[in-house]
C-alpha cells in the first residue's frame, strides 16, 4: 500500500504540480486532522492558502469561539479556515500574510505583512505581525502590537465594552480598533456610516463597509 501524500499548505500543493485554483485537503505534519482550504494558485506566483474570504454576505460570521477555532463556511465562497489550524501552521515555519480588499467603487488594494503568526489557544490566538507594505494604508489597520482574538462568547479585547458583540464577528479587537474584516456584510449603497461593518480604516476610513476581503498566507521565501 503506497503512502498517501499530504500537504500542510497550498504552497506544498503548488510545488507538487497542482497549479489550479480550487479546494484542497490540507493536513498538518504528525496529525490526522484534515481541513478543506481554498488555494489561490495564480495571484502573485500562487501557493496561497486562503484563511478568510468575504464576498456576498452568504455566511454568518457572528460565531462562537469554537466555530472560529475549527473554521466555518464554504471554502469555495465565504469562510474562515480556523484559528487552531492557522496557529499550528504558522508556528512551524515563517509565513507572510496578504490581505486583499475590494470596495464598492471597483477599487482594490492589499496589505502584505512579511511575518505573521498566531499564538496558541491558551494565549487566545493573539496575532503577531511584522513588516507592512502595500496599497491599503501605510499604517496597519490591525492594531499593533497584536491583540488577542475575541468572539461573541469570549471577550478578550481592551474595551470596557464587548467589541465582538458590538461590532459583530470574531476579530483581534483592541477597543475596538481600526479593522474588522469579519463584521456585518452590507450591500452597496447601504455600506457607509456603519458601526459594525467590514472595516479597514487606513484604506477606506471609518464607517465604510467593504465589498470583499481575502486573507491569505504563504511561506516566506516561496
Amino acid at each position: 500500500k503506497g503512502e498517501q501524500i499530504s500537504f500542510r499548505d497550498c504552497a506544498e500543493v503548488f510545488k507538487s504540480g497542482h497549479t489550479t485554483n480550487g479546494v484542497y485537503t490540507l493536513t498538518l505534519p504528525n496529525s490526522t486532522e484534515e481541513v478543506k482550504a481554498y488555494c489561490d494558485m495564480e495571484a502573485g506566483g500562487g501557493g496561497w492558502t486562503i484563511i478568510q474570504r468575504r464576498e456576498d454576505g452568504s455566511v454568518d460570521f457572528q460565531r462562537t469561539w469554537k466555530e472560529y477555532k475549527v473554521g466555518f463556511g464554504n471554502p469555495s465562497g465565504e469562510y474562515w479556515l480556523g484559528n487552531e489550524f492557522v496557529s499550528q501552521l504558522t508556528n512551524q515555519q515563517r509565513y507572510v500574510l496578504k490581505i486583499h480588499l475590494k470596495d464598492w467603487e471597483g477599487n482594490e488594494a492589499y496589505s502584505l505583512y512579511e511575518h505573521f503568526y498566531l499564538s496558541s489557544e491558551e494565549l487566545n490566538y493573539r496575532i503577531h505581525l511584522k513588516g507592512l507594505t502595500g496599497t491599503a494604508g501605510k499604517i496597519s489597520s490591525i492594531s499593533q502590537p497584536g491583540n488577542d482574538f475575541s468572539t461573541k462568547d469570549a471577550d478578550n479585547d481592551k474595551c470596557i465594552c464587548k467589541c465582538s458583540q458590538m461590532l459583530t464577528g470574531g476579530w483581534w479587537f483592541d477597543a475596538c480598533g481600526p479593522s474588522n474584516l469579519n463584521g456585518m456584510y452590507y450591500p452597496q449603497r447601504q455600506n457607509t456610516n456603519k458601526f459594525n461593518g467590514i472595516k479597514w480604516y487606513y484604506w477606506k476610513g471609518s464607517g465604510y463597509s467593504l465589498k470583499g476581503t481575502t486573507m491569505m498566507i504563504r511561506p516566506a521565501g516561496f
Partner: nanobody, 129 residues
C-alpha cells in the same frame, strides 16, 4: 440609517463667533459620543471637541480650550459647537461624527478618530478679515 448633518459655517472676521450645529438621526445621543473634527486644506483631520451626553463629559483640544464650548440638546438630538475668539488658523471644514459611547479602552476617557464610524458631510468655516 445613521445621518449627521452639520450647519452654521460661514465667513467670520478674526475675533468673531459662530455656532455650529450637528443634527443626528438614526441613533439616540444617550448611547453615543459626538465629536467635532476639522480639516484645513492640505492638513490631516484633527479632533476639536467631543461630548458624551449620558455622563455630560466633554473633551477639548488644547488649541481651542477656553474658546470653544460643546453642548447637546438630547430632545432635539443635536450637538452644538460654540466657537468664540476665532482665529485665521481655525479656518477649516468642520465635521461631526458619532461613536458608540461604550467603545472605550480601559483607563481612557476619549476615542481615537478611527472609532468614529458615522460622519457628516462637513461645513466650511472661514476666518478672515
Amino acid at each position: 440609517e445613521v445621518q449627521l448633518v452639520e450647519s452654521g459655517g460661514g465667513l467670520v472676521q478674526p475675533g468673531g463667533s459662530l455656532r455650529l450645529s450637528c443634527a443626528v438621526s438614526g441613533i439616540t445621543l444617550d448611547d453615543y459620543a459626538i465629536g467635532w473634527f476639522r480639516q484645513a486644506p492640505g492638513k490631516e483631520r484633527e479632533g476639536v471637541s467631543a461630548i458624551r451626553s449620558s455622563g455630560g463629559s466633554t473633551y477639548y483640544a488644547d488649541s481651542v480650550k477656553g474658546r470653544f464650548t460643546i453642548s447637546s440638546d438630547n430632545s432635539k438630538n443635536t450637538v452644538y459647537l460654540q466657537m468664540n475668539s476665532l482665529r485665521p488658523e481655525d479656518t477649516a471644514v468642520y465635521y461631526c461624527a458619532a461613536v458608540p459611547a461604550g467603545r472605550l479602552r480601559y483607563g481612557e476617557q476619549w476615542y481615537p478618530i478611527y472609532e468614529y464610524d458615522a460622519w457628516g458631510q462637513g461645513t466650511l468655516v472661514t476666518v478672515s478679515s
